[in-house]
Interface confidence: medium
């Protein structure tokens, strides 16, 4: 990747990621420098007849660093603080090739939940206020609500009116997704409204 447009790489929190390195064709590589947020991470000197010399210069990430045969960087047990800018400089006798990456650490989405605040009107129409959430959501998580394949909301929240006298049974599905995972959770309007109706008639007695 040219330094102008870094390759965006998604890593999953706690898992491993590889930043792929491409070599200049047919040129002998003198050394490779890997940088993280402009700070030296590792210095590699390849050898044709023996194992390469690898000098890890960042002790913080050092134990979690590895390199493939082609000197691509592998980072394991990813942490949120691994997010940032990575660069690899390949130096040959005649030139220096720069590869840039932006690593983004995303959480595998977990524990999708729907909370419901509903009310029953005197005309027996049920109004559902549904809120969808996932554990540790951030700005990279998008939510949407669907019913019968149609998008009803592009937010974690959905407000719908449901009339048991004229509406057929209806499921509403919340879909939460980020670049590495997606989750869905469906609720039945009929079931939710029946629950509200029971509460409503209980309190009226």
């Amino acid at each position: 990747q040219s330094s102008l447009t870094p390759l965006m790489v998604n890593g999953i929190l706690g898992e491993s990621v590889t930043l792929p390195l491409e070599f200049p064709a047919g040129e002998k590589v003198n050394f490779i420098t890997w940088l993280f947020n402009e700070t030296s991470l590792a210095f590699i000197v390849p050898h044709e007849t023996k194992s390469p010399e690898i000098h890890v210069t960042n002790p913080k990430q050092g134990k979690r660093l590895n390199f493939t045969q082609s000197y691509s960087l592998q980072l394991s047990n990813l942490k949120m603080e691994d997010t940032g800018s990575y660069r690899a400089q390949i130096s040959t006798k005649t030139s220096a090739k720069l590869s840039s990456y932006t690593l983004r650490i995303l959480r595998q989405l977990r524990n999708i939940q729907v909370t419901n605040h509903s009310q029953l009107f005197q005309n027996m129409t049920c109004e559902l206020h549904l809120t969808c959430s996932v554990e540790d959501a951030d700005d990279n998580v998008s939510f949407r609500w669907e019913a019968l394949g149609n998008t009803l909301s592009s937010q974690p929240n959905l407000t719908v009116s449901w009339d048991p006298r004229i509406s057929s049974e209806q499921d509403y599905t919340c879909i939460a997704e980020n670049a590495v995972s997606n989750l869905s959770f469906s609720v039945s309007a009929q079931k939710l409204c029946e629950d509200v109706k029971i509460q409503y008639t209980d309190t009226k007695m």
Epitope: S142, R144, S153, S154, Q155, N157, L158, T159, A179
Partner: antibody
């Protein structure tokens, strides 16, 4: 049918403030977030961010933090973009656009042309 | 941010000519999150093709979209006068959301 109607063109002096409105109709306003997009000849279409129309939470793109503010008048199904301390480079067309599912810009307002000049 | 590079920047085509506009992403994009917009002079952009290949309502069948990963394209089977416009690709999976710089299509 779904419509987004924006306020008219505006001419402002540098250092002043402008507030652009976007009136939504034809759908449940609080179910769909509202994006704001800037279009200029120099930089093309740039996403400024969006506001959650249910809880009012704005999200700003990095280039639009500080000087810009999104707000709502939910009862009037209207979203607002306020630009403070206007600069010449704020001269552009500004669009509101309704979010929808995996499509971020399903419906667009007609645009508001802002000219900043002394 | 993810950079979307469109080519060509400007293109003049004769009526009936087949046209292909490409959109190259600096990072792989799920096909569900790559969309195309058409903008005619003096108007706002309009959703044109969404999720890589689905034509928006009212879009003529001579248009099609395809692609995956980092390479996407919009094709017009046979250019017509009403197709004169700018076409923008847009990705919606990485924040910030980004647009290509646009391809301006003109009539020869």
């Amino acid at each position: 049918q779904i419509q987004l109607v924006q306020s008219g063109p505006d001419l402002k002096n540098p250092g002043k403030t402008v507030k652009i409105s976007c009136k939504a109709s034809g759908y449940t306003f609080t179910n769909f977030g509202m994006n704001w997009v800037k279009q200029s000849p120099e930089r093309g279409l740039k996403w400024m961010g969006w506001i959650n129309t249910y809880n009012g939470k704005p999200t700003y793109a990095d280039d639009f933090k500080g000087q810009f503010a999104f707000s709502l008048e939910t009862s009037a199904t209207t979203a607002y973009l306020q630009i403070n301390n206007l600069k010449n480079e704020d001269t552009a067309a500004y669009f509101c656009a309704k979010r929808g599912g995996t499509v971020d810009f399903g419906y667009w307002g007609q645009g508001t042309t802002l000219t900043v000049s002394s | 941010e993810v950079v979307l590079t469109q080519s060509p920047t400007t293109m003049a085509a004769s009526p009936g000519e087949k046209i292909t506009v490409t959109c190259s992403a600096s990072s792989p994009i799920s096909s569900n999150f790559l969309h195309w917009y058409q903008q005619k002079p003096g108007f706002s952009p309009k959703l044109f093709i969404y999720r890589t290949s689905i034509l928006a309502s009212g879009v003529p069948a001579r248009f099609s979209g395809s692609g995956s990963g980092t390479s996407f394209s919009l094709t017009i089977g046979a250019m017509e006068a009403e197709d004169v416009a700018a076409y923008y690709c847009q990705q919606g999976i990485y924040m910030p959301l980004t647009f290509g710089a646009g391809t301006k299509l003109e009539l020869k």
